[in-house]
């Protein structure tokens, strides 16, 4: 299987919520002795391999927001944890996984990253991320709402959480 | 602040089998993302991979040990077992247990026991 | 099996000095390395996960590089209490395997 970002680049106002997706494509197995772990947390552009560097997402740690399911099954964290920091991980069964962040501040940009594994009894693990940016804005060159920019040379798109 | 304890026998003979208990504290052994490992030690040596075992049941041993290596867990007493039979003096080491989060390193070690083969 | 070499062996050094490791994969492993510190009698300690990234609590004096086969563990000023003896670990694949160790000592 591959992840794939949907947009490469997310650029907000603040106090607006955002939901960054990854997209999980290609054969998933959903036998018995397989399961899926998928999380979140934010990084840095290392100048050898992105994504290598894991910090916590508002003081919640990688295993504070990780999902834990076989397949394409539906998760999402709903700890309170998680949400008393403004945040919820969520997979669905299209293998669409995201983080809403909500009331975003100036602190919240940077560089966020999704980490899918397959764990698969007696196997080593298989390994996928996906990296997307994220732009806090505030002033008149803030947008009015998030907009969302493709990591193709597709068109913006304005998304805003719900 | 999460704690891994190991106990055993400190000597086992030769042919016979090693058993050790991992005791976990500040912590759930169940937690979900999270490998158990053992890792050993022979005196004035380095460190070799026993093998591991994931929160949800699945295990991973070290090839050179497979046929003689089981670890297994009690989720009741918090606890991560170790089973290596039909020991030879080449055994000898110390004996770490050790946890390991989804892909990364271990990062949280037992103070480890020596165990020691003799007749 | 995937086979890691450091080097040195064992090396010498005096408080101050700045200090390299090196660490060899037998195959690519990424960036699926660690590095450890270990004093006698003691659990190793985790300073470095993914090549390159400090643990948590770790003073920023150790630092790592590297991708694929070759890495390096740098200690940019050697301090009384960094003489151990230091393994890289590979984390890539089963079955996961250690280095030999490098021992530094005080010159």
């Known amino acids: 299987f591959k992840v794939a970002t949907l947009y490469s680049l997310y650029v907000c106002p603040e106090g607006q919520n955002v939901t960054l997706t990854c997209r999980v494509f290609g054969p998933v197995d959903k036998g018995h002795d397989v399961t899926f772990y998928k999380t979140w947390y934010r990084s840095s552009r290392g100048e050898v391999q992105t994504c290598s560097e894991r910090r916590p997402i508002r003081n919640l740690t990688f295993q504070d927001l990780h999902l834990h399911h076989g397949g394409h099954q539906a998760a999402n964290t709903s700890h309170d944890l998680a949400q008393r920091h403004g945040l919820e991980s969520a997979s669905d069964h299209h293998g669409n996984f995201s983080i809403t962040m909500r009331n975003l501040t100036l602190l919240d940009s940077g560089l966020y990253c999704c980490l899918v594994v397959e764990i698969r009894h007696h196997h080593s693990e298989h390994r996928v991320h996906g990296a997307m940016e994220l732009q806090v804005q505030t002033g008149k060159d803030a947008p009015s709402s998030c907009v969302a920019y493709p990591s193709s040379s597709q068109e913006s798109e304005n998304i805003t959480a719900a | 602040q999460l704690q891994l304890q190991e106990s055993g026998p400190g000597l086992v003979k030769p042919s016979e089998t090693l058993s050790l208990t991992c005791t976990v504290s500040g912590g759930s052994i169940s937690s979900s993302g999270y490998y158990w490992g053992w890792i050993r030690q022979p005196p004035g040596k380095g460190l070799e991979w026993i093998g591991s075992?994931?929160?949800?049941?699945?295990?991973y041993y070290n090839p050179s040990l497979k046929s003689r290596v089981t670890i297994s867990v009690d989720t009741s007493k918090n606890q991560c077992s170790l089973k290596l039979n039909s020991v030879t003096t080449a055994d000898t080491a110390v004996y770490y247990c050790?946890?390991?989060?989804?892909?990364?390193?271990?990062?949280?070690w037992g103070q480890g026991t020596l165990v020691t083969v003799s007749s | 099996d995937i086979q890691m070499t450091q080097s040195p062996s064992s090396l010498s050094a005096s408080v101050g000095d700045r200090v390299t490791i090196t660490c060899r994969a037998s195959?690519?492993?990424?960036?699926?390395l660690a590095w450890y510190q270990q004093k006698p009698e003691k659990a190793p300690k985790s300073l470095i996960y993914a090549a390159s990234s400090l643990q948590s609590g770790v003073p920023s004096r150790f630092s790592g590089s590297g991708s694929g086969t070759d890495f390096t563990l740098t200690i940019s000023s050697l301090q009384p209490e960094d003489f151990a003896t230091y393994y890289c670990q590979q984390y890539n694949s089963y079955p996961y395997t250690f280095g030999q160790g490098t021992k530094l000592e005080i010159k």
């Open positions: 075992l994931y929160s949800s049941g699945y295990t």
């Open positions: 195959q690519g492993i990424s960036s699926w």
């Open positions: 050790a946890r390991h989060p989804v892909a990364m390193n271990f990062d949280d």
